[in-house]
């Protein structure tokens, strides 16, 4: 009886504490709309516990449902900046493997300078998330204005 | 063998269910940009399970990575209100201890009336979070328009 | 001694993995401001693990504190669309049982085309969440632009 009970306990390592919070490193070359991210305690308050960075893109290491969140602020931006350079759009998606490519989250700036959102989505080990900023405006690299993260929520 | 398995189980109290959701109490005097928060079931749907309020500011009681989220709506606001009084900015940060002071999350209203965002960040026991609303606009006190919360995510 | 320790372990089923992420199915008839949602793997990346849909509205199956999040984007929208048709407001609330009816989260579009926010709130088994979009603008049905979800956080 006690053995049956012990079986349904949740071992610590299966809890899936996978979590990451990244800061902007740089934008891509002109024809590459991707944002390139960096993370780690040496950089400030960013970190990766489980997921990894692959050439600035976030790669998932554990299957599960994740909360994905992002905030991007445009650099030296006023309420007219974004409207002058419309359309400026941010999309978060799975970019590899190609067979699983899909847009998960999309927002346009319109007359604002910041977009922020979050969603729950299933991700699989090996999925790489890309964040594409279309348009000609530079994002802010301030760590309190632009960030991207994931949190494992359940199997 | 069974003892080793039991050791890696996660005791309930170590799960770190720390969580809080606060509603706006009042703004500070003119030279104090901080928002003052309140929480508790007597006030409606706000609550504190773990963190505490210290003179209207949220104090963390457990080390870990937290999801911090906030929404602030400006009172009696139209699409031109924020632009009349530009700049109006909200910043969430650690304000004490002074040695750990840092801005975690920052958004400007520009031509909008509401900002909402969230991020993952490491917080330590004793960290006090302040929410600074710079500018001269009153925030809404409606509990579905202005709120601030944290959720412990992992050690 | 070991038995006492085993008692405070957390059984898997009590972890309350309840979670749902929904995509927009359709809007209601003219006098019904509610958005009608759908979810399930056959539809793409939406899912329900615990909560259920009741005529397009989300019904909670487990008491606890939940993170509720939403993003709604207006269809074929530019920065002037929302301002032409002001006010367009989204509210998420408990709509049944009537005794627990309350607005949990409210945002207006003003000059923007997307609203996105999240909050922690206590919900009880049987609570039905409704998302009311007031105004005359159609929301986008793109699954990366409009979505609604909940995540159980703690008892």
């Amino acid at each position: 009886q006690r053995f049956a009970q012990a079986q349904q306990q949740l071992p610590l390592e299966s809890l899936g504490w996978d979590v990451a919070e990244l800061q902007l490193n740089h934008t891509g070359p002109q024809q590459d709309p991707r944002l390139y991210w960096q993370g780690g305690p040496a950089l400030g308050r960013s970190f990766l516990h489980g997921p990894e960075l692959d050439k600035g893109q976030l790669r998932i290491h554990r299957d599960g449902i994740y909360m994905v969140h992002i905030q991007v602020t445009l650099a030296i931006c006023s309420s007219t900046t974004a409207s002058r350079h419309h359309p400026t759009t941010l999309a978060v998606g799975i970019c590899s493997p190609a067979s699983r490519s899909i847009s998960l989250l999309r927002l346009s700036f319109h007359q604002g300078c910041t977009i922020a959102s979050q969603r729950l989505t299933p991700l699989a080990r090996g999925d790489t998330l890309c964040t594409n900023l279309t348009g000609t405006l530079l994002p802010s690299r301030n760590t309190d204005e632009t960030f991207f993260g994931v949190q494992w929520v359940r199997p | 063998q069974r003892f080793a398995q039991a050791q890696q189980q996660l005791p309930l109290e170590s799960l770190g269910w720390d969580v809080a959701e606060l509603q706006l109490n009042h703004t500070g005097p003119q030279q104090d940009p901080r928002l003052y928060w309140q929480g508790g079931p007597a006030l409606g749907r706000s609550f504190l399970h773990g963190p505490e309020l210290d003179k209207g500011q949220l104090r963390i009681h457990r080390d870990g990575i937290y999801m911090v989220h906030i929404q602030v709506t400006l009172a009696i606001c139209s699409s031109t209100t924020a632009s009349r009084h530009h700049p109006t900015t909200l910043a969430v940060g650690i304000c004490s201890p002074a040695s750990r002071s840092i801005s975690l999350l920052r958004l400007s209203f520009h031509q909008g009336c509401t900002i909402a965002s969230q991020r993952l960040t490491p917080l330590a026991r004793g960290d006090t979070l302040c929410t600074n609303l710079t500018g001269t606009l009153l925030p809404s006190r409606n509990t579905d328009e202005t709120f601030f919360g944290v959720q412990w995510v992992r050690p | 001694q070991r038995f006492a320790q085993a008692q405070q372990q957390l059984p898997l089923e009590s972890l309350g993995w309840d979670v749902a992420e929904l995509q927009l199915n359709h809007t209601g008839p003219q006098q019904d401001p509610r958005l009608y949602w759908q979810g399930g793997p056959a539809l793409g990346r939406s899912f329900l693990h615990g909560p259920e849909l009741d005529k397009g509205q989300l019904r909670i199956h487990r008491d606890g504190i939940y993170m509720v999040h939403i993003q709604v984007t207006l269809a074929i929208c530019s920065s002037t669309t929302a301002s032409r048709h002001h006010p367009t407001t989204l509210a998420v609330g408990i709509c049944s049982p009537a005794s627990r009816s309350i607005s949990l989260l409210r945002l207006s579009f003003h000059q923007g085309c997307t609203i996105a926010s999240q909050r922690l709130t206590p919900l009880a088994r049987g609570d039905t969440l409704c998302t009311n979009l007031t105004g005359t603008l159609l929301p986008s049905r793109n699954t990366d632009e409009t979505f609604f979800g909940v995540q159980w956080v703690r008892p």
Epitope: - | A75, C77, T80, T81, S83, R84, H85, H86, T136, N142 | -
Partner: antibody, heavy 120, light 111 residues
Framework: QVQLKQSGPGLVQPSQSLSITCTVS????????VHWVRQSPGKGLEWLGV???????DYNAPFISRLSITKDNSKSQVFFKMNSLQADDTAIYYC??????????????WGQGTSVTVSS | DIVLTQSPASLAVSLGQRATISCRAN??????????MHWYQQKPGQPPKLLIY???NLASGVPARFSGSGSGTDFTLNIHPVEGEDAATYYC?????????FGAGTKLELK
């Protein structure tokens, strides 16, 4: 200390325009808005319009076509101009500072007032 | 436009007694968790002076004998105990929306 001092003519011919300058001290026009209010025996206190810190204006609808409020932040001056005055525009005209909170729309300091008579 | 109706138009009160002035709005002046009603005092030959903002908050330098109350559409200004310097006309003002409007005023005289 906070002060608003008004200067302008006391007598205006019918169909002519009224110009009043409000010079402020003790606060900055880049932080505070300035309202204009008039007071007449027949209509009591009547809000006319406001210029905000960002230079944006809001006017009371009946006056929108003949009222202009501008400012010069560097000189701490707000300029009020109303066109096509008639006899029923006879009143005391006040400038008043908007309360610190820009969306509270209360007026916490007032000018001394400019008494204006519209008559030929 | 929101119309504010003050009553009485005038009242006479003895020194040390209570003066009560009412202001009624034709629709709610509450929004965003606040109630946007303010009170002013005006003495002859002077501009109005802000007394109370957001129903019940005393403006800087206003004595504690002034108090405001009310909600929704019905509001009250109380002065107790009335002093000689309180002889003036009192106005309510809403700021729920544009245009801002004022009540017609209540003249307080001393018996």
């Amino acid at each position: 200390q906070v002060q608003l001092k008004q200067s302008g003519p006391g007598l205006v011919q019918p169909s002519q325009s009224l110009s009043i300058t409000c010079t402020v001290s003790g606060f900055s026009l880049t932080t505070y808005g300035v309202h204009w209010v008039r007071q007449s025996p027949g209509k009591g206190l009547e809000w006319l319009g406001v210029i905000w810190s960002a230079g944006i204006t809001d006017y009371n609808a009946p006056f929108i076509s003949r009222l202009s409020i501008t400012k010069d932040n560097s000189k701490s001056q707000v300029f009020f101009k109303m066109n096509s005055l008639q006899a029923d525009d006879t009143a005391i005209y006040y400038c008043a500072r908007n309360d610190y909170y820009g969306n509270l729309y209360a007026m916490d300091y007032w000018g001394q007032g400019t008494s204006v008579t519209v008559s030929s | 436009d929101i119309v504010l109706t003050q009553s009485p138009a005038s009242l006479a009160v003895s020194l040390g007694q209570r003066a009560t002035i009412s202001c009624r709005a034709n629709k709610s002046v509450s929004a965003s968790g606040y109630t946007f009603m303010h009170w002013y005092q005006q003495k002859p030959g002077q501009p109005p002076k802000l007394l109370i903002y957001l129903v019940s908050n005393l403006a800087s330098g206003v004595p504690a004998r002034f108090s405001g109350s009310g909600s929704g559409t019905d509001f009250t200004l109380n002065i107790h105990p009335v002093e000689g310097e309180d002889a003036a006309t009192y106005y309510c003002q809403h700021s729920r929306e544009f245009p801002l409007t004022f009540g017609a005023g209540t003249k307080l005289e001393l018996k």
